[in-house]
Interface confidence: low
Amino acid sequence: QRKRRNTIHEFKKSAKTTLIKIDPALKIKTKKVNTADQCANRCTRNKGLPFTCKAFVFDKARKQCLWFPFNSMSSGVKKEFGHEFDLYENKDYIRNCIIGKGRSYKGTVSITKSGIKCQPWSSMIPHEHSFLPSSYRGKDLQENYCRNPRGEEGGPWCFTSNPEVRYEVCDIPQCSEVECMTCNGESYRGLMDHTESGKICQRWDHQTPHRHKFLPERYPDKGFDDNYCRNPDGQPRPWCYTLDPHTRWEYCAIKTCADNTMNDTDVPLETTECIQGQGEGYRGTVNTIWNGIPCQRWDSQYPHEHDMTPENFKCKDLRENYCRNPDGSESPWCFTTDPNIRVGYCSQIPNCDMSHGQDCYRGNGKNYMGNLSQTRSGLTCSMWDKNMEDLHRHIFWEPDASKLNENYCRNPDDDAHGPWCYTGNPLIPWDYCPISRCEGDTTPTIVNLDHPVISCAKTKQLRVVNGIPTRTNIGWMVSLRYRNKHICGGSLIKESWVLTARQCFPSRDLKDYEAWLGIHDVHGRGDEKCKQVLNVSQLVYGPEGSDLVLMKLARPAVLDDFVSTIDLPNYGCTIPEKTSCSVYGWGYTGLINYDGLLRVAHLYIMGNEKCSQHHRGKVTLNESEICAGAEKIGSGPCEGDYGGPLVCEQHKMRMVLGVIVPGRGCAIPNRPGIFVRVAYYAKWIHKIILTYKVPQS
């Protein structure tokens, strides 16, 4: 078996750094090489070097090694910034703790346990001995530093300068004692570089022997330095990939700090009544998921087995069966007491009003100049100057650069839904910021709701009750499946995008969902030739309070005779009252022997004021809602059809003008349905489609 020993994991890397010797007597050796690994191997073996190598610099531009008999802690040396340089320092010479028996310890402690100064190894006074530096090459018997050249039980020791005491061990702590972490170590940035069984960790920037996704450049905030133990993925404690090809990864033995409190920077803001960001700090007592199913206790393994236990996730407050977000999901969740539903989001918990004092915006926030720099999901905003190319891609005027300072939330594109920012996360290129409109600000973002100013033309599940079966040209209609059962409707608005409602997603796991296209029968019977089944790759939640979701498909739908897209209306348009529209869905239809066929119910548009009267004044509609009433009493959408469309025709063009969402009644006589008004969110939809990456067909 041919395998070169790779020793680069024994070095601490400082990127873009070199060492400059102030003391001209210090030696340096240089040579042209291809990689930093080659420099490391030679430094570790001291091969062909006239000194003990303690550090090296790899010059990436010249492909050159500079080997040093000193490191950044040595006198006569200073650190200097340099783009093309990476400094690697042998950890043994900068570590102030020992691993195991301390055989590799090469630090500078030179005092014994009882405080006696050590005798130099090259001296025979006051004690004669055979531990000569020349006899123990590679054991670094330098000066009078504590060492353990034979790997004896007590750890590093030295001959003492006291003639009465021949030798004594030195009080150098174990690295596992020095290193400690809080909670489950997600914020741990210590220097532990071996696992609990003593295996040396693989460098995060290496892919041998184990290839992995945790590349330092891809996750700059995860602290993937050298080969130190980290917890980037919400495990119970820090871990690392190992250099043992037979053991991909292992946990590290890092004890919990005595004062187990998190740094201020790591603490999510604790809330009890509402969710801030992704709700990692939610500490309230809601204990059911969105649809009322009770949560399973975190300390119970029934009905669902899991490792999200209070012991594994300290500091995450996994008490009782309360909704929590211990793993950085998009919002609080829990395992459920229903054996058929493993997990669910507690999406009924409201979002906190994040505006503090003056941090609010007027109108659509285009003049907001506050200094918030975080998105509503808790992502840090990235600098505007790094994203100008992307910004120019979706606006057709020159943005006011004087407003786009740092990474503060801004609204350079006149977005109707407030300030936003780019994130630097390729999956979520941009998102809105958690800033509210200022209290009392009634500036409408769209005017003249009930008067047709802008034409809509250019253009999806609640159950449709008492509707008529349909087969004609409804290729944009999507059946969203949850664990292989129909749960919601949706509209295919682009080959890779489905518009639906946020209430359609009870589970955190996208693998639980599929989109069925091209079907007429809810079970797909007789639709085999035309049916397309697509996985879901991402959910993009609409602006605050919209109840909309854009669901990204894992691959684009193939448009054919059975699958087509439906148009979106113009932004801010209004459709004339009494315009005839339709809602579609597969939900329960009021018939005893329901045949599972897609139904349509015909409705007509009703102005918001009149709609409010029909609801006996109990409902005030705003600019983000649209109302439609039934021509036939008791015909309209209900709960199997949430996410489905209200489709209207204007100038011979069919468009999705509304989305069916829960909470507004179910085909009650004389009670028109209230839908999410797609025209109000059309710019947001276009912006997502334009800026989010989708798989190519």
Partner: antibody
Framework: QVQLVESGGGLVKPGGSLRLSCAAS????????MSWIRQAPGKGLEWVSY????????YYADSVKGRFTISRDNAKNSLYLQMNSLRAEDTAVYYC???????????????WGQGTLVTVSS | DIQMTQSPSSVSASVGDRVTITCRAS??????LAWYQQKPGKAPNLLIY???SLQSGVPSRFGGSGSGTDFTLTISSLQPEDFATYYC?????????FGQGTKVEIK
């Protein structure tokens, strides 16, 4: 498109030697880690050996260690398996497989050759 | 070495049926598991990687789940071309090991 074509299989007596080749095309061979995997008649799959893209890292299954040698020639887009001291239990179809880097996620065999049959019998 | 045990060793099913195959690892392998399909006289074909990610070009009726030691391959609606032998493979560490295979036959 990606293609892997094995050759060099045949009938050999116990204790004999054989050299298998795998010709790669349709992708940048020198960027990929490669493996040999075998399947005895009517049996399951057994991973045999692995070589990194540069050839500097090599691993073998215990059952072949010391007898088989994996190598590659990136200039010729070829992977090799030198098999010495062959035994009856080495009889199998030998596949060469590309180990897809998959954007840095982990090891998996995304393309396989059609296989070459090695029969060890007296 | 990590042992991979598949069950059942064979299953008889009809077109349209939902088929589930399980794979158990002798020790925890996180999500480092792949599923392959092999038809007689042909090379294996990668279906699922990292326990649940669908390899491009594979029909969405194939799905994978699980982590740790227990994994499942599900074919939601069996098609005529799905009759084959299925193997799981762990990629947690060398030596990479496969399950003994599960043959899906026509009932």
């Amino acid at each position: 498109q990606v293609q892997l074509v094995e050759s060099g299989g045949g009938l050999v007596k116990p204790g004999g030697s054989l050299r298998l080749s795998c010709a790669a095309s349709g992708f940048t061979f020198s960027d990929y880690y490669m493996s040999w995997i075998r399947q005895a008649p009517g049996k399951g799959l057994e991973w045999v050996s692995y070589i990194s893209s540069s050839g500097s890292t090599i691993y073998y299954a215990d059952s072949v260690k010391g007898r088989f040698t994996i190598s590659r020639d990136n200039a010729k887009n070829s992977l090799y398996l030198q098999m010495n001291s062959l035994r009856a239990e080495d009889t199998a179809v030998y596949y060469c497989a590309r180990d897809e880097y998959n954007s840095g996620w982990y090891v998996l065999f995304d393309y396989w050759g059609q296989g070459t049959l090695v029969t060890v019998s007296s | 070495d990590i042992q991979m045990t598949q069950s059942p060793s064979s299953v008889s099913a009809s077109v349209g049926d939902r088929v589930t195959i399980t794979c158990r690892a002798s020790q925890g392998i996180s999500s480092w598991l792949a599923w392959y399909q092999q038809k007689p006289g042909k090379a294996p074909n990668l279906l699922i990687y990292e326990a649940s990610s669908l390899q491009s070009g594979v029909p969405s009726r194939f799905g994978g789940s699980g982590s740790g030691t227990d994994f499942t391959l599900t074919i939601s609606s069996l098609q005529p071309e799905d009759f084959a032998t299925y193997y799981c493979q762990q990629a947690n560490g060398f030596p990479w090991t496969f399950g003994q295979g599960t043959k899906v036959e026509i009932k």
